[in-house]
């Protein structure tokens, strides 16, 4: 028998520095977690103690903090190289800055193979990107070889900016021939490493003949066997065992997100490459694990540029940006409009001639807007200003909801109106009229939404049975501010870009902004 240790991360999302327990900015260092310096300590400890170790990343290193905003992926290559990752799969967010924003900072600089079997380049890009990412890689480990085959969410064109010269194929269809090739190379230990979410990970384990282990990402799935060490609630045991169609037991793993845990899986193979046993657990990277001094020093060196960036002007406003709770928790506020407009703008994807865009709607809890921006400071808007407006380090995500769920959400928005509570929704691509004289749960008297399957966008009444795409904060997607119906009834959820980054990019693009209050949210006569 031959034993392999798989160390794995996924959805790190730019958390190079240690974070608080909820993966936001570290405040009290003695209680902080994660970060590449701490990760390196643990990885090195395991490498020294065990003979056959692979360190793998399942995608979405890009996007999530000011580190990515400033360094644009160079930080990912630098610190992943320093940690000596063995391989990485491409995630959807690796395409956030377009293909060039992937090629130059990461693909050309990574000292480890970057993989995806279901992304096929065409046209002029094919020769430019050739060899910079691979469908699979055979890695030598001790006296054996291990095949790693990569995959990426086929929804990436709707979630990021891969352009028109990359085709995202069905994962299972694309993986099978590559696994067959590995088998033909007499490689009998095969890991599928990819970024399509836990449901697809399980399907790959079930359907792709020859895959021995699946290491996934995208869905931020936390798996754990025994008593979990922090706040995350396990979605199942670690590893999650799937019985394949040909009768094999295939371990599937994921390691939550944000570098809070290091996935740790031990696999025992027989001489024919069959998995005999698998066990392990994610390792919580808490403050009991010291940060590696040399990596920490490097982080501090790179950090200097971030502090300078946060005070630079992104653009100007010529109007007061009203982000006060007195406005945003009670009525349409222009800060809410600005943020929603930025959210939609960030999700412009012309992937189908029938649609002007794949999504037109935005909702945003008023309580998530934490500060106004005064235009009387020469109109200057900085990252620092935006960090005061959006201090929680969240993301603006894409969900699919039925019209009936949206209606419930808008009823919830005003179910206890007047108490300055955070659930009052700011909107984009939506016209809502409330009648507060009616009883809670029956206050939405008009709800019109902007069409997407149209060449001239216009507002049509919401249809209860129709499925709509909506951009919203991850806080709402996870049921925050009492929006349990969103969490319970959403049909799809894909995590998006860092909230501040979305707004800062929009402001930089527009250069001068002047958002207005324009009648997106109305109250019917006599009730307000």
């Amino acid at each position: 028998a031959w034993e392999l240790t798989i160390l794995h991360t996924n959805d790190v999302h730019s958390r190079l520095e240690q974070t608080s327990e909820d993966s936001s900015k570290c405040v009290n260092a003695s209680r902080c977690m994660g970060g590449v310096a701490r990760l390196f300590t643990k990885v090195q400890q395991i490498r020294r103690a065990e003979p056959n170790v692979l360190l793998l990343d399942a995608g979405d290193q890009y996007q999530g903090t000011i580190w990515f905003t400033v360094y644009k992926g160079a930080e990912v290559a630098h610190f992943m190289n320093a940690l000596r990752y063995d391989a990485m799969a491409l995630g959807n967010h690796e395409f956030d800055n377009g293909v060039e924003g992937l090629i130059e900072p990461l693909l050309k600089e990574a000292k480890f193979p970057i993989l995806s079997a279901n992304i096929k380049a065409k046209g002029p890009l094919a020769s430019q990107i050739s060899g910079l990412y691979l469908p699979y890689k055979v890695l030598p480990v001790g006296d054996e070889v291990v095949g790693i085959v990569g995959y990426t969410s086929k929804e990436t064109p709707f979630l990021s900016n891969p352009g028109t010269n990359l085709v995202f194929e069905d994962e299972i269809t694309a993986l099978q021939p590559e696994v067959d090739k590995l088998k033909t190379l007499n490689v009998n230990k095969i890991i599928a490493l990819g970024h399509s979410g836990f449901e697809m990970d399980k399907l790959i384990a079930q359907k792709v003949r020859g895959v021995d282990v699946v290491v996934g990402g995208h869905s931020n799935t936390f798996l754990y066997t025994g008593n979990p060490p922090s706040k995350e609630v396990p979605a199942g045991k670690y590893p999650f065992i799937v019985t394949s169609d040909d009768g094999r037991k295939v371990p599937v793993v994921q390691a939550y997100a944000f570098g809070k845990y290091l996935g740790y899986l031990k696999i025992e193979f027989d001489e024919r490459g069959n998995v005999i046993s698998s066990h392990g657990n994610p390792i919580l990277l808490n403050s009991s694990i010291p940060e590696d001094p040399s990596i920490k020093a490097d982080i501090n060196k790179w950090r200097i540029k971030l502090d300078n960036y946060s005070t630079q002007e992104l653009g100007k406003t010529i109007v007061y940006l009203d982000g006060s709770s007195q406005s945003c928790r009670f009525r349409e506020c222009n800060m809410g409009n600005l943020i929603c407009d930025a959210m939609i703008n960030n999700n412009l994807r012309h992937t189908d001639e029938m649609f002007w865009n794949h999504v037109s709607m935005c909702i945003l809890n008023g309580g998530g807007i934490r500060s106004p921006i005064d235009e009387r400071n020469n109109g200057t808007i900085t990252w620092e200003n935006l960090a005061a407006v959006l201090p929680f380090g969240g993301t603006f995500d894409l969900v699919q909801l039925k019209g009936s769920t949206l209606k419930k959400a808008f009823e919830h928005s005003v179910h206890r109106y007047g108490q300055s509570t955070g659930e009052f929704l700011q909107v984009g691509g939506i016209h809502v009229v409330y009648d507060l004289s009616r009883k809670p749960g029956d206050r939405v008297v008009k709800l019109d939404v902007l069409c997407t399957k149209c060449r001239v966008p216009s507002y049509d009444p919401l249809k209860m049975d129709e499925v709509y795409k909506v951009i919203l904060p991850n806080f709402l997607a996870n049921g925050g501010d009492g929006f349990q119906m969103i969490k319970d009834e959403l049909l799809r959820h894909d995590s998006g870009d860092q909230d501040i980054n979305v707004v800062s990019t929009y402001i930089s693009k527009m250069k001068v902004i002047y958002p207005a209050v324009e009648g997106r949210i109305k109250f019917s006569t006599g009730s307000h």
């Epitope: 050309k108 030598p140 190379l185």
Partner: antibody, heavy 118, light 107 residues
Framework: QVQLQQSGPELVKPGASVRISCKTS????????IYWVKQRPGQGLEWIGW????????KYNEKFKGKSTLTADKSSSTAFMQLSSLTSEDSAVYFC???????????WGQGTLVTVSS | DIVMTQSHKFMSTSIGDRVSITCKAS??????VAWYQQKPGQSPKLLIY???TRHTGVPDRFTGSGSGTEHTLTISSVQAEDLALYYC?????????FGSGTTLEIK
């Protein structure tokens, strides 16, 4: 473009050792195997072994264990092969080569002629 | 070790002819076979891998076929620059092994 530049010819005495270098450029050194291949005059090709610079893993053809030692220097993107206890049987042209994606030899150095003679 | 046998040490041909060079493996190597061309004083050059996949820049007159133990390199219309030594190699398992070579010469 991918290039593998080998060190020049060597004339060595029996029993001595020789170290051949293979300096690479035009790609990320750590991401591909470097293979070494022996070709005796008028003879075929023999695979000596590989080194994977990413994790410095080395695999030898059993036939060449003890004869050759493979190393790599990531900082200079250079692979090395040392041949020890040389005999006339070791007189050959030695090639380094890079894989495309494992197991076949897509790019070759120009070869280094080693002559063992007293 | 897997032995790759190229039974023809030499093959004579004429410019414009179609020629097939064969290679037999001592055990099943599936489709894990590569072909190389070597000219005097030069290093080998990869032509084909995975039995039938042409390497970048290789003219389409070169094709590979076969599976299991029997493999063939075919040149559909021999050009003067094709006169060289051709080796097969199995990339199925280590140690990777080569055939002894077939020299293509003019009749």
């Amino acid at each position: 473009q991918v290039q593998l530049q080998q060190s020049g010819p060597e004339l060595v005495k029996p029993g001595a050792s020789v170290r051949i270098s293979c300096k690479t450029s035009g790609y990320t050194f750590t991401n591909y195997y470097i293979y070494w291949v022996k070709q005796r005059p008028g003879q075929g090709l023999e695979w000596i072994g590989w080194i994977y610079p990413g994790n410095l893993n080395i695999k030898y053809n059993e036939k060449f264990k003890g004869k050759s030692t493979l190393t790599a220097d990531k900082s200079s993107s250079t692979a090395f092969m040392q041949l020890s206890s040389l005999t006339s049987e070791d007189s050959a042209v030695y090639f380094c080569a890079r894989d495309d994606n494992y197991a076949w030899f897509a790019y070759w150095g120009q070869g280094t002629l080693v002559t063992v003679s007293s | 070790d897997i032995v790759m046998t190229q039974s023809h040490k030499f093959m004579s041909t004429s410019i414009g002819d179609r020629v097939s060079i064969t290679c037999k493996a001592s055990q099943d190597v599936s489709t894990a076979v590569a072909w190389y061309q070597q000219k005097p004083g030069q290093s080998p050059k990869l032509l084909i891998y995975w039995t039938n996949t042409r390497h970048t820049g290789v003219p389409d007159r070169f094709t590979g076929s076969g599976s299991g133990t029997e493999h063939t390199l075919t040149i559909s219309s021999v050009q003067a620059e094709d006169l060289a030594l051709y080796y097969c190699q199995q990339h199925y398992s280590t140690p990777f092994t080569f055939g002894s070579g077939t020299t293509l010469e003019i009749k």
